[in-house]
């Protein structure tokens, strides 16, 4: 004999500064009128009253005077909340309680959001650099809501994860300050991008800082690599490139070149003695042999497998010696992934149902994002799990438990953090009762 | 009534690992900041992880501990976890899970009774 | 890292008298600021956050002020149960969320 009150399952997202209406509705029945009403909007955990309706009369806000109901809609079932001016401390969960003859409630989440500003980027120190210098490189963003994530990438899109260290700092208003510091050993040169992702408006601000340094005097080999991992698909062939410069009169009698594992030292390749010694890893390797009096050391990599990724060790010495390090990354793209509901027929509004959504055979582990169809983000009652075939694919699995609505898109994004490739997938569900697949 | 118990202390040797558990109850869960303090014998207080409020999972650690302890959370349970690896010495404490105020005020206005975690060979 | 630097150690004073403790941060944390109380024993307990406003249930004989660097946590006039250890703690900057190192308030 309870009063059905409705109100959206997702949180409302709201802008600091904006106003946001709490939706919630109930069915009056006939005759009804205003005057047998009592409506209280409450907040749902300390019970503090924001706003009531009672004795037929609006009583007002007792929310520092930023709230209103629709008065014109409250015959009708319409006991929405209007929120004025957004704060971050009005972030939370405010409970719709309406009571007539009957009585019911349900509280519904107000998510507040506020964007991050374009990262401004420093960097410590900023003069006379060399190769093998260490800098620390600054990216801040300013005044977002809530808590950003940031990630460090090169110029090649490869993420930096070591030494990074992010803070975060909380103004008056609630609003963040977040400042994250990379520390790197410069290369050749190097393009260092941070990216600050507002995990709830799904926004995501870049800046990015190209370091050319200055050359280093050296009496050793100077043995180039590129300083951003070598991105290879599996199953594709990858070249592992490596140069020095050779001086006048050089031959390759003089030659010695090894590439070995760079953390175990085991040997993958060398020439010596004027000759190419061979593979020395699954014969897969071969060098340029055409290509090495003009200084080209660079390595192929045949046929591509996860067990691959690392790095490499490139050791050049002449009269000197000179050895730089190079690194694989491997990579797999995930297939579009498949959708499937559990239970998938008979389907009504208010059933909790489960969604599946598969992607396969991808390197490396996938992130998996939910979103319904206004592309709001889906974070509550998702597991997703990844599972590793022999040749160290992954499969990722993940299961989204909702309760239905009236109808909704639920879409799937399996993405690959290396390749930056998105596989999406989606299901509508509509209509009552409702079956999936739709018959045709 | 907000409640936090924390659980899985004990005494273990120094290398191995750890799981402790806090069952909140009372609040909105999923809504709130949570984190973890320990307290060594006779020391003061020292705040060792903290992750944010809903299913984000940003997460900070103490220097003194990162890269060997993992906070999580599974909201569905209201239950916040710590995973501890390469236990020390000096992580011996009484570990208290407490509530943020909220995610952009973390003042701790909740704490669990603590779990005492004795890291000896 | 913002270091907070609580001052005395100790305190020693009887039932009734005013205890004056003190905060001092290494660089400014605005108003983010909040005072604990511990007993032997016991999970610390919240009595002031935002520098100066009392949490639920805590007694008006404890007041807190300051901002900026420097914070002073006030207990008028000190009660047989106020015995304990204080600690503040800054939450305007993280990692990490910062404590002093504590004032021990001990009876005369």
């Known amino acids: 004999g309870a009063l059905e009150v409705q109100v959206p399952e997702d949180p409302v997202v709201a802008l600091v500064g904006t106003d946001a209406t709490l939706c919630c509705s109930f069915s009056p029945e006939p005759g009804f009128s205003l005057a047998q009403l009592n409506l209280i909007w409450q907040l749902t955990d300390t019970k503090q009253l924001v706003h009531s309706f009672a004795e037929g009369q609006d009583q007002g806000s007792a929310y520092a005077n930023r709230t209103a109901l629709f008065p014109d809609l409250l015959a009708q079932g319409n006991a929405s909340l209007r929120l004025q001016r957004v704060r971050v401390a009005d972030e939370g969960s405010f409970t719709c309680f309406v009571s007539i003859r009957d009585f019911g409630s349900a509280a519904v989440s107000l998510q507040v959001a506020a964007p991050y500003s374009k990262p401004s980027m420093t960097l410590e120190p900023n003069k006379d650099l060399r190769p093998g210098d260490t800098v620390t490189i600054t990216c801040s963003s300013y005044q977002g809501y809530p808590e950003a994530e940031v990630f460090w990438q090169d110029g090649q899109g490869v993420p930096l994860t070591g030494n990074v260290t992010t803070s975060q700092m909380a103004n008056e208003q609630g609003l963040f300050d977040v400042h994250s510091i990379l520390r790197v050993v410069l290369g050749a040169n190097g393009t260092y991008s941070c990216l600050v992702r507002n995990p709830v408006l799904q926004q995501d601000a870049h800046s990015s800082v190209t370091i050319t340094p200055q050359r280093s005097p050296t009496g050793a080999v100077e043995v180039q690599v590129p300083e951003d991992p070598v991105v290879a698909l599996v199953g594709t062939d990858a070249t592992l490139r490596c140069s020095f410069s050779p001086e006048p009169g050089f031959s390759l009698a003089q030659l010695n070149l090894i590439w070995q594992l760079t953390d175990t030292k085991q040997l993958v390749h060398s020439f010596t003695e004027g000759r190419d010694q061979g593979s020395a890893y699954a014969n897969r390797t071969a060098l340029f042999p055409d290509l090495l009096a003009q200084g080209n050391a660079s390595l192929r990599l045949q046929r591509v497998r996860v067990a691959d990724e690392g790095s490499f060790t490139c050791f050049v010495s002449i009269r000197d010696f000179g050895s730089a390090a190079v690194s694989l990354q491997v990579a797999a793209p995930y297939s579009k992934p498949s959708m499937t509901l559990e239970p998938n027929k008979d389907l009504r509004p208010g059933d909790t149902v489960t969604i599946t959504c598969s992607s396969y055979r991808g390197y490396p582990e996938a992130e998996v994002f939910w979103q319904d169809g206004q592309g709001v983000p889906l974070t509550g009652n998702v597991t997703t799990s990844q599972m590793a075939n022999e040749q160290g694919l992954f499969d990722v699995h993940s299961v989204l438990r909702v309760v239905l609505g009236a109808n909704g898109t639920y879409s799937c994004l399996v993405r690959n953090p290396v390749l930056q490739q998105d596989a999406h997938g989606s299901v509508t569900i509509t209509g009552q009762p409702m079956t999936f697949p739709p018959e045709a | 009534d907000v409640q936090l118990v924390e659980s899985g202390g004990g005494v273990v040797r120094p290398g191995e690992s750890l799981r402790l558990s806090c069952a909140a109850s009372?609040?909105?869960?999923?809504?709130?900041?949570m984190n973890w303090v320990r307290q060594a014998p006779g020391e003061g207080l020292e705040w060792v992880s903290r992750i944010n409020y809903k299913g984000y999972n940003i997460t900070y650690y103490a220097d003194s501990v990162k890269g060997r302890f993992t906070i999580s959370r599974d909201n569905s349970k209201n239950t916040l976890y710590l995973q501890m690896n390469s236990l020390r010495a000096e992580d011996t404490a009484v570990y208290y899970c407490?509530?943020?105020?909220?995610?952009?005020?973390?003042?701790?206005?909740?704490w669990g009774l603590g779990t005492l975690v004795t890291v000896s060979s | 890292e913002i270091v907070l630097t609580q001052s005395p150690g100790t305190l020693s004073l009887s039932p009734g008298e005013r205890a004056t403790l003190s905060c001092r941060a290494s660089q400014t944390v605005g108003s983010k600021l909040a005072w604990y109380q511990q007993k032997p024993g016991q999970a610390p307990r919240l009595l002031i956050y935002g520098a100066s406003t009392r949490a639920t249930d805590i007694p008006d004989r404890f007041s807190g002020s300051g901002s900026g660097t420097e914070f002073t946590l006030t207990i008028s006039s000190l009660q047989s149960e106020d015995f304990a250890v204080y600690y503040c703690q800054q939450y305007i900057n993280w990692p990490p969320l910062s404590f002093g190192g504590g004032t021990k308030v001990e009876i005369k």
């Open positions: 407490a509530k943020s105020g909220s995610n952009s005020n973390n003042f701790f206005d909740y």
């Open positions: 009372g609040f909105t869960f999923s809504n709130y900041a």
